[in-house]
């Protein structure tokens, strides 16, 4: 019968979402509940994933697969799978030891994650400042300034600011 | 809780297929063996074989050439298919949720069975 | 495959006297994967003992298991008339899953 006598592994028998049983002369055993195998052949089941606290769960566990978390409102998946959650900051801050803190000038974040990063220099392109950096956007470049020469172009040279790439906060 | 209910022809004719299924009602047919176990009249039990949800069977070898067990996870049901069959078919035949593990690992024998339907092969 | 052996066949008793069951195996059977089930009349099996002591939920406790190996005992400690029945034991260590042939338990 279907428990192989042959040569080969009777655990390869044992489809995913069973366990090859030790116990008994290595037949397929169903996974107790909360635990898992994704693939054939497994002489264990592997505990479910449990979230937990600031995780939530995406996905439940089932007999072939684990459990799958995202994070709650305000924080976010860090990591492979999810296994961390970090805090969301606004727009122009970045999270750091003491909490969110807004860029420093001259950079910027367009996220609730992650650091905050220098503005686009243009001038490395050749380009020009078109818009003005803030703490949430980059610069937008533009033409270069040779490219504005009268009657090149249509575009309306922005005006002077204080320092380059910088809007007044 | 966990019901199971046994459906089919009541009679069959020699050297004609035997079909049953078994609807699980209650819960989900999924990440259990599910088990076929017959009767004959006066006589004790004999298990047929059994099936998990994914299709991966075990027959019993008494049986195993005339036996064909499927599943339908969608409908929550399994099915048995008994060829060729004779008088020596006649029985009741129960279908009955296989032994599991509980999260402790303690296990259980087959703890949920159906009311039984009872088949009658003759011409 | 393991053959089962149960002894009596038949159990003559009256109500309120103690019941033994006796169940053999060909050969060893670990305790955690023998069941005993009780059949009435028309009825399905129903489980009494699972990993052959432990009673299933909703099973009085006058009825009780034990043994190991190839030596598995039923005892009912004081017969009620709704006891009167067969009694069936199962091992499901080894493929295939095989029953004894019951001890049916009648009022002497």
């Known amino acids: 019968f279907e428990r192989t006598r042959s040569l080969q592994d009777p655990c390869s028998n044992c489809p995913a979402g069973t366990f090859c049983d030790n116990n008994r002369n290595q037949i397929c055993s169903p996974c107790p509940p909360n635990s898992f195998s994704s693939a054939g052949g497994q002489r264990t089941c592997d505990i479910c994933r449990q979230c937990k606290g600031v995780f939530r769960t995406r996905k439940e566990c089932s007999s072939t697969s684990n459990a799958e978390c995202d994070c709650t409102p305000g924080f976010h998946c860090l990591g492979a799978g999810c296994s961390m959650c970090e805090q969301d900051c606004k727009q122009g801050q970045e999270l750091t030891k003491k909490g969110c803190k807004d860029c420093c000038f001259g950079t910027f974040n367009d996220q609730k994650r992650g650091i905050c990063r220098p503005w686009t220099n243009c001038s490395l392109d050749g380009k020009s400042v078109l818009v003005n950096g803030t703490k949430e956007r980059d610069v937008v470049c533009g033409p270069s300034p040779a490219d504005l020469s009268p009657g090149a172009s249509s575009v309306t040279p922005p005006a002077p600011a204080r320092e380059p790439g910088h809007s007044p906060q | 809780q966990v019901q199971l209910q046994e459906s089919g022809p009541g009679l069959v004719k020699p050297s004609e297929t035997l079909s049953l299924t078994c609807t699980v009602s209650?819960?989900?047919?999924?990440?259990?063996?599910w088990s076929w176990i017959r009767q004959p009249p006066g006589k004790g039990l004999e298990w047929i074989g059994r099936?998990?949800?994914?299709?991966?069977?075990n027959y019993n070898p008494s049986l195993k050439s005339r036996v064909t067990m499927s599943v339908d996870t969608s409908k929550n049901q399994f099915s048995l298919k008994l060829s060729s069959v004779t008088a020596a078919d006649t029985a009741v035949y129960y279908c009955?949720?296989?032994?599991?593990?509980?999260?402790?690992?303690?296990?259980?024998?087959?703890?949920?069975w159906g009311q039984g339907t009872t088949v009658t092969v003759s011409s | 495959e393991i053959v089962m052996t149960q002894s009596p066949a038949t159990l003559s008793l009256s109500p309120g006297e103690r019941a033994t069951l006796s169940c053999r195996a060909s050969q060893s059977v670990s305790s955690n994967y023998l069941s005993w089930y009780q059949q009435k009349p028309g009825q399905a099996p129903r489980l009494l003992i699972y990993g052959a002591s432990t009673r299933a939920t909703g099973i009085p406790a006058r009825f009780s298991g034990s043994g190991s190996g190839t030596d598995f005992t039923l005892t009912i400690s004081s017969l009620q008339p709704e006891d009167f029945a067969v009694y069936y034991c199962q091992q499901d260590y080894d493929l295939p899953w095989t029953f004894g042939q019951g001890t049916k338990v009648e009022i002497k």
């Open positions: 009955a949720r296989d032994g599991w593990y509980d999260e402790d690992y303690n296990y259980y024998g087959m703890d949920v």
């Open positions: 209650g819960g989900s047919i999924s990440s259990y063996y």
């Open positions: 099936i998990y949800t994914s299709g991966s069977t």
